[in-house]
Amino acid sequence: CTCVPPHPQTAFCNSDLVIRAKFVGTPEVNQTTLYQRYEIKMTKMYKGFQALGDAADIRFVYTPAMESVCGYFHRSHNRSEEFLIAGKLQDGLLHITTCSFVAPWNSLSLAQRRGFTKTYTVGCEECTVFPCLSIPCKLQSGTHCLWTDQLLQGSEKGFQSRHLACLPREPGLCTWQSLRSQIA
């Protein structure tokens, strides 16, 4: 299973649920579905209030039981470490894959934290982070922001990922804007 890691704003906008949580148990494999689930302790929710409704406490995260079918395997044994988890809701259950955005909270830049807590949501409706994977690449719309981190850095941990968000400048136009200047 291979996938290009998304810009964190894309991960935020394309996910049904974005939370901060600790992984508190070893995975359990369901004898019927062959999906595995991890027990988690949610500490914050950044997106998904409406989708969840009253069931606002997520206790488990579900993923395929094998790497080759995009299953997520949690390698950290530190049960007090917090992770940012962006996933999809299926039948009221939080699902993630290898391609989901799952990262230690402490590994995120201050700008990214600001993005997840406040700013990325502003760009979800109108703006699109457009990956530029090979030259030449051009903007297909004024609401697109060209994401060149992978081209220039060979990594999703580039400057645009760590410090910028694609936000509306004016109707029909989105541009990269610094999250650092907005940090409280």
């Epitope: 070893t26 494999v29 004898q31 019927t32 579905t33 062959l34 395929p64 080759s68």
Partner: antibody, heavy 114, light 110 residues
Framework: QVQLVESGGGLVQPGGSLRLSCAAS????????MSWVRQAPGKGLEWVSA????????YYADSVKGRFTISRDNSKNTLYLQMNSLRAEDTAVYYC???????WGQGTLVTVSS | DIALTQPASVSGSPGQSITISCTGT?????????VSWYQQHPGKAPKLMIY???NRPSGVSNRFSGSKSGNTASLTISGLQAEDEADYYC??????????FGGGTKLTVL
């Protein structure tokens, strides 16, 4: 009590095909994933393939991927393993097993030889 | 391609205790609490002796016990009896290969 009965084994030439069946009884078949495990003569156990209770998810060992197909018919309480492009190294006793592999059948012998 | 490492053979006298180890990695034994142990007599199908690391199915003698530390699981048989002579296999879920077995250990009761 739980019973798993395999059938369909036999002698087949290299490159040939065979379809194994496993008839299950004594439990709610659709509530359990099922696996095929094999054991070559004088050798250890090797997991071959697994399928979820609904049949929607399937998994294969690298050694059989692209050649074997696991399936199930929940209305007949039966598990299948379609084996194509058989090789000499596929010679083994094939067992079907339930869930986390708590119950096993008695096995059926597949011999691939010219 | 054996995924879990077991000793090829162990032996003990009647009444003694023996332990069989099963070493894997953090993506199998160390990553899941799903280690099982099977007993297989010649010409017979394997029989489940221990599941979920340390649980015994009903009907299995309490002389059989299982444990796990890190990436290594262990099966202990106390008060060895002649009928315990058999091959023993460990098995675990594995994130990369889905399910893996050990190479097997031949137990001889002297």
């Amino acid at each position: 009590q739980v019973q798993l009965v395999e059938s369909g084994g036999g002698l087949v030439q290299p490159g040939g095909s065979l379809r194994l069946s496993c008839a299950a009884s004594g439990f709610t078949f659709s509530s359990y994933a099922m696996s095929w495990v094999r054991q070559a003569p004088g050798k250890g156990l090797e997991w071959v393939s697994a399928i979820s209770g609904s049949g929607g998810s399937t998994y294969y060992a690298d050694s059989v991927k692209g050649r074997f197909t696991i399936s199930r018919d929940n209305s007949k309480n039966t598990l299948y393993l379609q084996m194509n492009s058989l090789r000499a190294e596929d010679t083994a006793v094939y067992y079907c097993a339930r869930g986390h592999v708590d119950y096993w059948g008695q096995g059926t012998l597949v011999t691939v030889s010219s | 391609d054996i995924a879990l490492t077991q000793p090829a053979s162990v032996s003990g006298s009647p009444g003694q205790s023996i332990t069989i180890s099963c070493t894997g990695t953090s993506s199998d034994v160390g990553g899941y609490n799903y280690v099982s142990w099977y007993q297989q007599h010649p010409g017979k199908a394997p029989k489940l002796m221990i599941y979920d690391v340390s649980n015994r199915p009903s009907g299995v003698s309490n002389r059989f016990s299982g444990s796990k530390s890190g990436n290594t699981a262990s099966l202990t048989i106390s008060g060895l009896q002649a009928e315990d002579e058999a091959d023993y296999y460990c098995q675990s879920y594995d994130f990369v290969r889905f399910m893996v077995f050990g190479g097997g250990t031949k137990l001889t009761v002297l």
